[in-house]
């Protein structure tokens, strides 16, 4: 025999108090699948948590973090403090990146500058706490007599249009 509750769609619950008819989820609750015997309470985004998506009868609310914080954990269950660019969050708070490392975001860890010489290149722009180094042409390309400029295209004879 088929369970009468299996006919109840998302956004409703199978109400045992009313002969197992499908009743809509009450305010501030939802059911994301059919055949539910109860609706789940909507998540409330309070304090540091801001509402990114309102709760509906078929889906939970989604939260993100207020400026100065960023989401951590499944479904943004926590908000971690931002640092400034050029810093990382340690057990003692936000600390500047050590020399030779950088962080171009407000979260995450300081990463080592790119080692240009590993690719046979030279440093074009030095790195900072906030920015990685910019690698340029290889030192061989910069040796005297060598040109890093692309040779110009051959000039056309005047009066001749391209074929």
């Amino acid at each position: 025999l088929q369970d009468p509750c299996s006919n109840c769609p998302a956004g409703t619950f199978c109400d045992n108090n009313r002969n197992q008819i499908c009743s809509p989820c009450p305010p501030n609750s939802f059911s994301s699948a059919g055949g539910q015997r109860t609706c789940d309470i909507c998540r409330q985004c309070k304090g540091v948590f801001r509402t990114r998506k309102e709760c509906s009868s078929t889906s939970n609310a989604e939260c993100d973090c207020t400026p100065g914080f960023h989401c951590l954990g499944a479904g943004c269950s926590m908000c971690e403090q931002d640092c400034k660019q050029g810093q990382e969050l340690t057990k003692k708070g936000c600390k500047d990146c050590c020399f030779g490392t950088f962080n171009d975001q407000k979260r995450g860890i300081c990463r080592p500058w790119t080692n240009c010489s590993l690719d046979g290149k030279s440093v074009l722009v030095n790195g900072t706490k906030e920015r990685d180094v910019v690698c340029g042409p290889s030192p061989a390309d910069l040796s005297p007599g060598a040109s890093s400029v692309t040779p110009p295209a051959p000039a056309r004879e005047p009066g001749h249009s391209p074929q």
Epitope: G68, S77, M78, E80, L89
Partner: nanobody, 124 residues
Framework: QVQLVESGGGLVQPGGSLRLSCSAS????????MSWVRQAPGKGLEWVSD????????FYEDSVKGRFTISRDNAKNTLYLQMNSLRAEDTAVYYC?????????????????WGQGTLVTVSA
């Protein structure tokens, strides 16, 4: 071991003020966000306020905004809740709670340590 001990509760008339304190020990207080949570008689737990580790970011339940002020003294390892313009509906046991990760604010379900609570009664 982590210990949180609240004090400062009592009987106060409507419109009056109280200042709750929460003395913390057993962890690096200055690295953790802290919260106040309350439980009115016969009701569930209700989040009241959060403060981040450094004290520069504070957050409040709508019903207490403008009346309650959360603060902390990291040198004294103490959390405070200044409660002004108290109402009968503020009657509850007030708990302080610690957040589980450094420099992170969690939801109430994830707080890892709670005090034993202090009772605030607002009545004429």
């Amino acid at each position: 071991q982590v210990q949180l001990v609240e004090s400062g509760g009592g009987l106060v008339q409507p419109g009056g003020s109280l200042r709750l304190s929460c003395s913390a020990s057993g962890f690096t207080f200055s690295s953790y966000a802290m919260s106040w949570v309350r439980q009115a008689p016969g009701k569930g737990l209700e989040w009241v306020s959060d403060i981040n580790s450094g004290g520069e970011s504070t957050f409040y339940e709508d019903s207490v905004k403008g009346r309650f002020t959360i603060s902390r003294d990291n040198a004294k390892n103490t959390l405070y809740l200044q409660m002004n313009s108290l109402r009968a509906e503020d009657t509850a046991v007030y708990y302080c709670a610690k957040h589980p990760l450094t420099y992170t604010i969690a939801t109430m379900n994830d707080y890892d340590y709670w005090g034993q609570g202090t009772l605030v009664t607002v009545s004429a």
